[in-house]
């Protein structure tokens, strides 16, 4: 079957956040996908779009990500720009209402989206063969 | 297909101002993903950006001409604009106006050029 | 402020060969560099970004790598109009361009 336009969507979004580090890509997450042993596909997408928005929410307006120059502002709009079209979009995937999410070791934010980056090329992979 | 076009005097003279108007075509100004710089090229010699301005109307100027330059935007024109004070001889050169950013990356170069205005300086 | 240092100035080869061209950073600026190209009486025009992504429309022959503090421009088979100068940019935490390389040929 065809991959969903949403995955596509995804992983554009992926590739977008992952080409350039920001003053934030090396802030902490909650690294839901490293304890994604027995949770379904669903689950995960869910959760992953819960840390990100409790991410985005606290770090918006962050100084430290704002930083000094109207070049680093851009940066951290567009950074958070991303990481909202992304929650979307994983929402959607998902099709959940909510999720709980536990307790977790923390990851960086860059590390965190490759590992998602992963995943995602992968579930492509295997629904456009 | 975005364009560039930089107008304003080619000539002025020592302790005046220079001011210098990008006309943008083929698109908007006002796109948060986008920003738009100015630099220049003494004959003969390389590339110094002097400035940039964001859709917000917030700057960064080059720390060197910070205290000369403003550059300011009109949406409503579809333009932006700089103006440098005090100029010397050593102003004169091919100014440019440039976009840079991007609506599908963090930040990108800049890639769309406008052809360039040569202002000298002089008395 | 970040000092970008180009080399070499100007350098001179036949059409065919590999030219490569060196930018030095004085302070880490990840992959946030740019190549361009200026012909005589023309703005710069985008060949690299990112260090190493090649822009829309522009030949394959034209490469870059490097990460932090060291990047490398290349040429694999100089052609005539690839006549111009070349100049390095970060825009890690604003803008500075290097001084440029004038190719020319042999």
């Known amino acids: 079957h065809k991959c969903d336009i949403t995955l596509q969507e995804i992983i554009k979004t992926l590739n977008s956040l992952t080409e350039q580090k920001t003053l934030c890509t090396k802030l902490t997450i909650t690294d839901i996908l490293a304890a994604s042993k027995n949770t379904t596909e669903k689950e995960t997408f869910c959760r992953a779009a819960t840390v990100l928005r409790q991410f985005y929410s606290h770090h918006e307006k962050d100084t430290r990500c704002l930083g000094a120059t109207a070049q680093q502002f851009h940066r951290h709009k567009q950074l958070i720009r991303f990481l909202k079209r992304l929650d979307r979009n994983l929402w959607g995937l998902a099709g959940l209402n909510s999720c709980p999410v536990k307790e977790a070791n923390q990851s960086t934010l860059e590390n965190f989206l490759e590992r998602l980056k992963t995943i995602m090329r992968e579930k492509y992979s295997k629904c456009s063969s | 297909q975005l364009q560039l076009q930089e107008s304003g005097p080619g000539l002025v003279k020592p302790s005046e101002t220079l001011s210098l108007t990008c006309t943008v075509s083929?698109?908007?100004?006002?796109?948060?993903?986008?920003?738009w710089g100015w630099i220049r090229q003494p004959p003969g010699k390389g590339l110094e950006w002097i400035g940039s301005i964001y859709y917000s109307g917030s700057t960064d100027y080059n720390p060197s001409l910070k205290s000369r330059v403003t550059i300011s935007v009109d949406t409503s024109k579809n333009q932006f604009s700089l103006k440098l004070s005090s100029v010397t001889a050593a102003d004169t050169a091919v100014y440019y106006c440039?976009?840079?950013?991007?609506?599908?990356?963090?930040?990108?170069?800049?890639?769309?050029w406008g052809q360039g205005t040569m202002v000298t300086v002089s008395s | 402020d970040i000092q970008m240092t180009q080399s070499p100035s100007s350098l001179s080869a036949s059409v065919g060969d590999r030219v490569t061209i060196t930018c030095q950073a004085s302070q880490d600026i990840s992959n946030y560099l740019n190549w361009y190209q200026q012909k005589p009486g023309k703005a710069p025009k985008l060949l690299i970004y990112?260090?190493?992504n090649l822009e829309t429309g522009v030949p394959s022959r034209f490469s870059g790598s490097g990460s932090g503090t060291d990047f490398t421009f290349t040429i694999s088979s100089l052609q005539p109009e690839d006549i111009a100068t070349y100049y390095c940019q970060q825009y890690y935490d604003l803008y500075t361009f290097g001084g440029g390389t004038k190719v020319e040929i042999k």
């Open positions: 990112d260090a190493s």
């Open positions: 083929g698109g908007s100004i006002s796109s948060e993903s986008y920003y």
């Open positions: 440039a976009r840079g950013g991007a609506s599908d990356r963090i930040d990108h170069a800049f890639d769309i």
